[in-house]
Interface confidence: medium
């Protein structure tokens, strides 16, 4: 288990290019938004110290037909080593709570900012 | 400790030309986006310009596009302003700012310099 | 152009609790930053990330964003905290960086 600032991730760390793609492909959905995000679909929220890539992949799996977010499914896939099932890492929902996708991937964004701005990444 | 030092206000005629800059120090400079930001007297904060830390980006605020430019020497850690048509109602203290990541859409500034007063005045 | 609103002014009591309010269309969507100036100064960044706080800046200052406000709240405050705090985002449908007009805050 590699741990990252307490942003845990299995297997091998990304790359920082790869990572700025990620946070990039997060800024672009999250500031163009002209409708709410996935027709306001609720994903399981998830404790982004404790948990990893592959919690964010696990939790955003749940959503289907929703192209705004496929590429961040697919990057998110890209930087976890093995196949996620949806309900696979349940013990890190954060108290059963669900939020949009919207804000689910704001936090993401911001939390993987942090870890940016701590050094973790560069 | 990080340390900006703006430079080169005073006072011009309008339709005269300035050139503002600020030394940096205690970062990689090169690693950061950096900004302008000024604040006419008794007025709010109003953002003029920003740049790239590659400086292949810039920004600029609708009222001084055309007639400011922004660039940045990364080998002496120094940011510019190049003003020209220079109007009444550009006078105001010009901040300095650093940004706190490299992606646009996520950037706060962490650290202000002094200012330097540019009054526009016949 | 996107546009932020600040109420001008806000006034209260030492050791009671302030809260400054950023109001801009869906900005739970954006990214919110605080800066506080004092007169005389350059601004200080306080919040930034919606709710994060610098080193060196106070526990009392915390931030929220959500829906189409964001908060600054500034508990248990001081006279040393009056001063003018201004909201900031970036718009990306302008590449612009947008500040709010700013709030004075009064320490009765």
């Known amino acids: 288990l590699t741990c990252l600032g307490g942003f845990a991730s299995p297997g091998p760390v990304p790359p920082s290019t790869a990572l700025r793609e990620l946070i990039e492909e997060l800024v672009n959905i999250t500031q163009n938004q002209k409708a709410p995000l996935c027709n306001g679909s609720m994903v399981w929220s998830i404790n982004l110290t404790a948990g990893g890539f592959c919690v964010a992949l696990d939790s955003l799996t749940n959503v289907s037909g929703c192209s705004a977010i496929e590429k961040t499914q697919r990057m998110l896939s890209g930087f976890c080593p093995h196949k996620v099932s949806a309900g696979q890492f349940s013990s890190l929902h954060v108290r059963d709570t669900k939020i949009e996708v919207a804000q689910f991937v704001k936090d993401l964004l911001l939390h993987l900012k942090k870890l940016f701005r701590e050094g973790q990444f560069n | 400790e990080v340390q900006l030092l703006e430079s080169g206000g005073g006072l011009v005629q309008p339709g005269g030309s300035l050139r503002l800059s600020c030394a940096a120090s205690?970062?990689?400079?090169?690693?950061?986006?950096m900004s302008w930001v000024r604040q006419a007297p008794g007025k709010g904060l109003e953002w003029v310009s920003a740049?790239?830390?590659?400086?292949?980006?810039?920004y600029y605020a609708d009222s001084v596009k055309g007639r400011f430019t922004i660039s940045r020497d990364n080998s002496k850690n120094t940011l510019y302003l190049q003003m020209n048509s220079l109007r009444a109602e550009d006078t105001a203290v010009y901040y300095c700012?650093?940004?706190?990541?490299?992606?646009?859409?996520?950037?706060?500034?962490?650290?202000w310099g002094q200012g330097t007063l540019v009054t526009v005045s016949s | 152009s996107y546009v932020l609103t600040q109420p001008p002014s806000v006034s209260v009591a030492p050791g009671q609790t302030a809260r400054i309010t950023c109001g801009g269309n869906?900005?739970?969507?954006?990214?919110v930053h605080w800066y506080q100036q004092k007169p005389g100064q350059a601004p200080v960044l306080v919040v930034y990330?919606?709710?994060d706080r610098p080193s060196g800046i106070p526990e009392r200052f915390s931030g929220s964003n959500s829906g189409n406000t964001a908060t600054l709240t500034i508990s248990r405050v001081e006279a040393g905290d009056e001063a003018d705090y201004y909201c900031?985002?970036?718009?990306?449908?302008?590449?612009?960086?947008?500040f709010g007009g700013g709030t004075k805050l009064t320490v009765l």
């Open positions: 700012a650093k940004a706190d990541f490299w992606s646009g859409t996520l950037w706060g500034f962490d650290y």
């Open positions: 205690g970062f990689t400079f090169s690693s950061y986006a």
């Open positions: 740049i790239s830390g590659s400086g292949g980006s810039t």
């Open positions: 869906n900005i739970g969507n954006k990214i």
């Open positions: 990330d919606d709710s």
């Open positions: 900031q985002v970036w718009d990306s449908s302008s590449d612009h960086v947008v």
